[in-house]
Amino acid sequence: LIIGFGISGRHSITVTTVASAGNIGEDGILSCTFEPDIKLSDIVIQWLKEGVLGLVHEFKEGKDELSEQDEMFRGRTAVFADQVIVGNASLRLKNVQLTDAGTYKCYIITSKGKGNANLEYKTGAFSMPEVNVDYNASSETLRCEAPRWFPQPTVVWASQVDQGANFSEVSNTSFELNSENVTMKVVSVLYNVTINNTYSCMIENDIAKATGDIKVTESEIKRRSHLQLLNSKAS
């Protein structure tokens, strides 16, 4: 969490941002809140990015002002206009690119004063893994697949019954570059699995950690998966 204060002649206002991660090829949100004002026309929001000449986005007098927007953000940004009045200056970013990573500044002017806070935005790719029984294999085998990751993650298998066991000798992981030549498909195969056991395929990079679980019994197969972003820190 980054909390910034204004330092102008006018009073300072508190601006709060939260570091976050964007998923390449999806929409992202850069979070920023501030002490609200009673008049929308008195609020100015400016989003800036370190190393970028033009503005990322500007909102003033109740609407977007795009004349100074940098080329790399054209047609890709919007604030939640109906929530500005309650102090939400968060920016929606369309079609996140690897190059969107960096340090952003959320700068606010209201009738109460000015304030700003920085935000670290990481970009990469992360997706939910799906674990299935591979019926084509000669022995009982599990196949864990996740369609989009970047940077290249690590893949670790674990089991409920054999806690702490190292499965690296009985697993094989491959990474296949996707068509846009950035993200990769992750495929990991675990051999010699036993029934009545729960196996977990854990995929992790510096942005996200995802787990796919599978429980195989004689009568049924149960699956569960979840994903957690690793770098959401508030400022």
Partner: antibody
């Protein structure tokens, strides 16, 4: 050659449901945002919804929010529009359209459309 | 929501004449304005992107101008195949809106 072929249109009663499909070929489907745009008889174009290249992000026009669901299957190169709680005013030709790759928000390729008629 | 207003609703001209179609946005959209042509029974076709940028395969007689709230599509010398409906589209935000269209008909 880029091709977008819509299907699934037809006659449906008010309150009913319908699923439209759009089969894409001639380009790397999984790299592009895709949209549905509709056109009521004798009227102008109305953007309906978009879905991100990976399928994880969607955005809808206010007129269909909560009733329509856009999705995609990149393995099948297919875009979908699940329409429910249909109203007479949803009667239109529905086009699937590809958004520009570099900077979105304009449509460089369109399908020929599929007709949806909502009537009792 | 940004409202796009096109004028005139109908424009009657003869082949060889110059056509000027207007589009106005309810608020400034910089140059985030795109133009499409639609013929009866066909899908729309992209003509101009970002107010004035030409599209590969589109004849040079089609040009666009404007910024902020006021935009113009110009067809320098009308060909018979140019008679169609023309739409402008706001491309600045997430909720994409079209104008109601200008029908270009033969006089």
């Amino acid at each position: 050659e880029v091709q977008l072929v819509e299907s699934g249109g037809g006659l449906v009663q008010p309150g009913g449901s319908l699923r439209l499909s759009c089969a894409a070929s001639g380009f790397t489907f999984s790299n592009y945002y895709m949209s549905w745009v509709r056109q009521a008889p004798g009227k102008g174009l109305e953007w309906v919804a978009y879905v991100s290249s990976g399928g994880g992000s969607t955005y809808y026009s206010d007129s269909v929010k909560g009733r329509f669901t856009i999705s995609r299957d990149n393995a099948k190169n297919t875009l979908y529009l699940q329409m429910s709680s249909l109203r007479a005013e949803d009667t239109a030709v529905y086009y699937c359209a590809r958004e520009s790759y570099s900077q979105g928000n304009y449509f460089d390729y369109w399908g020929q459309g599929t007709t949806v008629t909502v009537s009792s | 929501e940004i409202v796009m207003t096109q004028s005139p609703a109908t424009l009657s001209l003869s082949p060889g004449e110059r056509a000027t179609l207007s589009c106005r946005a309810s608020q400034s959209i910089s140059d985030y304005l795109h133009w499409y042509q639609q013929k009866p029974g066909q899908a729309p076709r992209l003509l101009i992107k970002f107010a004035s940028q030409s599209i590969s395969g589109i004849p040079a007689r089609f040009s666009g101008s404007g910024s902020g709230t006021d935009f113009t599509l110009t067809i320098s010398s009308l060909e018979p195949e140019d008679f169609a409906v023309y739409y402008c589209q706001n491309g600045h935000s997430f909720s994409l809106t079209f104008g109601q269209g200008t029908k270009l008909e033969i006089k």
